[in-house]
């Protein structure tokens, strides 16, 4: 059971427009969809192909597109097919043909008062109407003696006389669009004494200084005259020349002649000639100095041997068109061959290292010469000079690694680190020569390290496995200022690294031995109850057979950390009173006491005349205000630690007392009255 | 005859779901693009989504205002189609509709089942 | 999304009277279009497919033209048993979508 969902539906469709036809199909299986036009299955195109199971047209075509189209849809497992409706197109078109002579049957026939029909052949669907012109002036039907029968596609002209000679065209419009006459008709109906074009003068193109020559004839009966203007409507005669043309020659058969042209002569030159009846005839021609511009300069260019490869010439600006040519050691190129010339572009075909070189396009004409070089280099594969090796680099100290090859061009070189691209900074530096710098190498620098040499030709690559030699160094190095707190236990670790791995012991700095409850464990000082007598200096040491030993000193304190004994406490104050927080710690070395109050320090040397902070740590404001809320923190430190203490500090308005309060109604809250 | 019965509306909670079931006999089920459409009460017509036959993977479409909430699906062994509510809204309450339509030869059909009510409320 | 818009939204006539109901899409849905009858209580019934056909057993009386985007649904004389509301749908493009609807009254 096939069903279609959409079916194709006929419709208007513009010649060369889109359009599409839509089928839609839905079945129990698998399907394939293809369509019929007039019961042949449709092939596809580019033009015309399916989209899904639609059929789509690029550009709608009158003839190959006209036709019932069907949508077939096949169920190849059961052979059940099913056929939609049948869809068409209304295909709307015009298409331009020529004016051409329907009566007489030649042009040699026609004579003065003879009837002449001259036919458009201009078709379309919708038909289209149609409009005559003759000079590219409009005609209107009932116009002095022609008719137009747009049914016929006709204009006669009865009887034709010489005042209907010249261009006819026509032009017809539709619901498509419009179109106009491929090729127009000229006729010519003599009359003796009409002024005829015998020779029309041509557009010269002219080098700077050279002459040049218009000819221009009339012929008529009585002769008719003739004369030249240029431009400015000026007359051009044997005695009467305009100051620019002073060196212009009219001779006696109409033809005129200037001798070394300058720019100022360039123009429009009008030949006109007057029967003794009729229009006057004006011919015109132009005369254009000769020109050309500079060429745009090539990009050297990398080819590679073995491809085939173009270079454009694009050609100067230039009048005339300047004619192009490429040459290469001197030596013009052929049109054919492996290196050659097509058009205006190089061809090299499989090339070869001898074709590298400088090849020259050059363009000419009239007004001179230019030519432009592009520099071909054949690209090679890179070949080594020296490969990087594997290495034993010392922690510390920069480490390099080779990668020299050579090629055309310059070969570019990258290097990779466990295949992830090295980016040159402060660590890493690859020279022009390609030889990879480590500035400081650290011990995760031992890993593998590949370098790849490039070219457009191809590449190279190599690796090589760096293996650090690490110094004999403190993992980290122990503080050499450290605390202790006085009658508990403590711990100073030491741990170090190297090639070897090393042994760590300590030793007081006087060399006296360790007391008993003090123990060095594999690097760790252990002190088990401080005592006072254990303050003083200390050396870690750490030594291997290789690299010998290491020492870091340390300055050992012992102290009595900090404790507070009295603690600021929450406070809230009237405005303008005065606020008192306390703070007292002990500890030895003895604490100094600093405040922050709102997240800055308070300097005591800045505090001003409202705050100050006594030799116990306590802190007074006087007069405070609303802006003195907020937390206030009491910080003790010494020489071994630090400790910090907050409260906050609420500064309010004074209640106004009611009546029914008695003077000794308490505060609402705790407060601090001064 | 033709026949569409949808089953398993009812009232449930904002959040809460529900499964519809439209049952088919009378026509070849399996070859047809089944869609649902919903009405909410004194409202207009509402497409909701639909599943396409075999012959076109069982493609599913929905409207944008269920998107990610219901689910289409069909068994051609039972002739049945269902939607699957998820995440139900209050602005879900309808009657909602099975229906199939297309060209079989060349005589246009277009099937509707009675409808089920489904009530979102808390 | 294609919007349909129907008009009118609702439409009084005489039995008798020639009635159009009007469609129009957002964009271009060639003759993809259906006319649905609906009455209260009952399931939307077909009426006109492919914006012109009318549909198997559908009295004569209905008729639908139109392309592209703009559609007529006309009841050439009205009937007692025609109260109803109308809807136009297009099936050009998913989502498929429908207009808003016409209440057919008598008055």
């Known amino acids: 059971a096939i069903v279609f969902i959409k079916q194709p539906s006929s419709q208007d469709a513009l010649q060369g427009r889109r359009a599409l036809l839509r089928c839609e199909v839905e079945a129990p299986g698998p399907v394939h969809v293809y369509w019929l036009l007039d019961g042949a299955p449709v092939q596809d195109t580019e033009r015309r192909f399916a989209q899904g199971s639609s059929l789509s047209f690029a550009a709608v075509d009158r003839l190959q597109d006209s036709g019932t189209f069907q949508c077939v849809a096949r169920d190849d497992v059961t052979g059940e097919e099913a056929r939609s409706a049948n869809a068409s197109f209304n295909i709307k078109w015009i298409e331009a043909g020529p004016v051409v002579l329907k009566h007489p049957a030649s042009e040699a026939e026609i004579q003065p008062q003879t009837q002449v029909t001259l036919r458009c052949h201009i078709d379309g669907h919708p038909r289209p109407t149609y409009q005559w012109f003759r000079d590219g002036t409009p005609l209107s039907d009932g116009q002095s003696n022609h008719t137009v029968s747009s049914k016929e596609r006709n204009l006669t002209l009865r009887p034709a006389g010489p005042e209907h000679s010249g261009l006819y065209s026509c032009c017809a419009h539709s619901a498509f669009g419009q179109a106009c006459s491929s090729q127009n008709f000229t006729l010519s109906i003599a009359d003796e004494s009409f002024a005829r074009v015998v020779l029309a003068p041509q557009d010269v193109v002219v080098a700077r200084y050279e002459e040049a020559m218009f000819h221009c004839q009339f012929s008529a009966q009585p002769p008719p005259s003739l004369q030249w203007l240029f431009e400015d409507e000026t007359p051009i005669t044997n005695r009467s020349r305009p100051p620019h043309l002073r060196r212009a020659t009219v001779f006696a058969n109409g033809s005129l002649l200037l001798t070394q042209v300058r720019p100022r002569n360039a123009g429009i030159y009008r030949c006109i000639g007057q029967g003794q009846r009729g229009p006057p005839i004006i011919l015109e021609a132009t005369l254009h100095l000769a020109e050309i511009e500079d060429m745009p300069l090539f990009e050297p260019r990398v080819f590679t041997a073995g491809s085939e490869e173009r270079v454009t010439c694009l050609p100067p600006k230039g009048l005339p068109e300047p004619s192009v040519w490429w040459e290469h050691a001197g030596v013009r190129l052929p049109t054919h061959g492996r290196v050659y010339q097509k058009g205006h572009e190089l061809v090299l075909a499989n090339i070869a290292e001898s074709d590298a070189g400088v090849y020259t396009c050059h363009a000419a004409n009239l007004a001179g010469q230019r030519r432009q070089d592009v520099n071909i280099t054949v690209a090679t594969v890179p070949s080594w000079l020296k490969k990087p090796q594997d290495s034993q680099l010392e922690e510390g100290k920069p480490g390099y690694l080779d990668c020299l090859t050579q090629a055309t061009p310059k070969p570019t070189v990258v290097w990779y680190r466990n295949q992830m691209l090295i980016s040159e900074d402060s660590r890493f530096e690859v020279f022009k020569n390609g030889t990879l710098r480590i500035n400081s190498v650290e011990v995760y620098d031992g890993t593998w390290y590949r370098c790849m040499s490039s070219t457009p030709a191809g590449s190279i690559e190599a690796q090589a496995r760096v293996q650090v030699l690490e110094k004999l160094k403190f993992t980290p190095p122990p503080q050499p200022q450290q605390c202790m707190e006085f009658d508990k236990e403590a711990t100073v670790p030491c741990s170090a690294t190297g090639r070897e791995k090393p042994t760590i012991k300590w030793e007081r700095a006087d060399g006296s031995s360790l007391p008993e409850w003090v123990t060095d464990n594999a690097g760790t000082l252990h002190f088990a109850r401080v005592t006072r007598d254990d303050a003083g200096n200390y050396t870690c040491i750490a030594s291997n057979g290789p690299q010998g030993q290491i020492r870091a000193h340390v300055q050992l304190t012992v102290a009595v950390f900090i404790t507070f004994k009295v603690e600021p406490e929450r406070t809230t104050v009237y405005q303008g009173h005065t606020a008192l927080l306390q703070c007292e710690a002990q500890g030895d070395p003895k604490p100094l006491i600093q405040w922050k109050g709102k997240d800055r320090i308070l300097d005591p040397t800045k505090l001003g005349p409202r705050m100050h902070i006594f030799q116990n740590g306590s802190l007074v404001i006087h007069d405070v205000a609303p802006e003195d809320s907020g937390r206030y923190t009491c910080i003790a430190g010494n020489s071994c630690n630090i400790k910090h203490t907050e409260a906050p500090l609420y500064v309010v308005d004074k209640p106004v007392p009611e009546e029914s309060e008695g003077p000794g109604s308490p505060p609402p809250y705790k407060m601090i009255q001064t | 005859e033709v026949q569409l019965v949808e089953s398993g509306g009812g009232l449930v909670q904002p959040g809460g779901s529900l499964k519809l079931s439209c049952a088919a006999s009378g026509f070849t089920f399996s070859g047809c693009a089944m869609h649902w459409v919903r009405q909410a009460s004194g409202k207009g017509l509402e497409w909701v989504g639909r599943?396409?036959?075999?012959?076109?993977?069982?493609?599913?479409t929905y409207a944008a205002s269920v998107k990610g909430r219901f689910t289409i699906s069909r068994d051609d062994s039972k002739n049945t189609a269902y939607l699957q509510m998820n995440s139900l809204k209050t602005e879900d309450t309808a009657v909602y509709y099975c229906?199939?339509?297309?060209?079989?030869?060349?005589?246009?059909?277009?099937?509707w089942g009675q409808g089920t009510l489904v009530s979102v409320s808390s | 999304d294609i919007q349909m818009t129907q008009s009118p939204s609702s439409l009084s006539a005489s039995v008798g009277d020639r009635v159009t109901i009007t469609c129009r899409a957002s964009?271009?849905?060639?003759?993809?279009l259906n006319w649905y009858q609906q009455k209260p209580g009952k399931a939307p019934k077909l009426l006109i497919y492919d914006a012109s056909n009318l549909d198997k057993g559908v009295p004569s009386g209905f008729s639908g033209s139109g392309s592209g985007t703009d559609f007529t649904f006309t009841i050439s004389s009205l009937q007692p048993e025609h109260i109803a509301t109308y809807y136009c749908q297009q099936y050009d493009n998913l989502p498929i979508t429908f207009g808003q609807g016409t209440r057919l009254e008598i008055k």
């Open positions: 599943i396409r036959s075999k012959a076109n993977n069982y493609a599913t």
């Open positions: 229906t199939s339509r297309g060209y079989s030869g060349f005589d246009w059909f277009d099937y």
């Open positions: 964009q271009d849905i060639s003759n993809y």
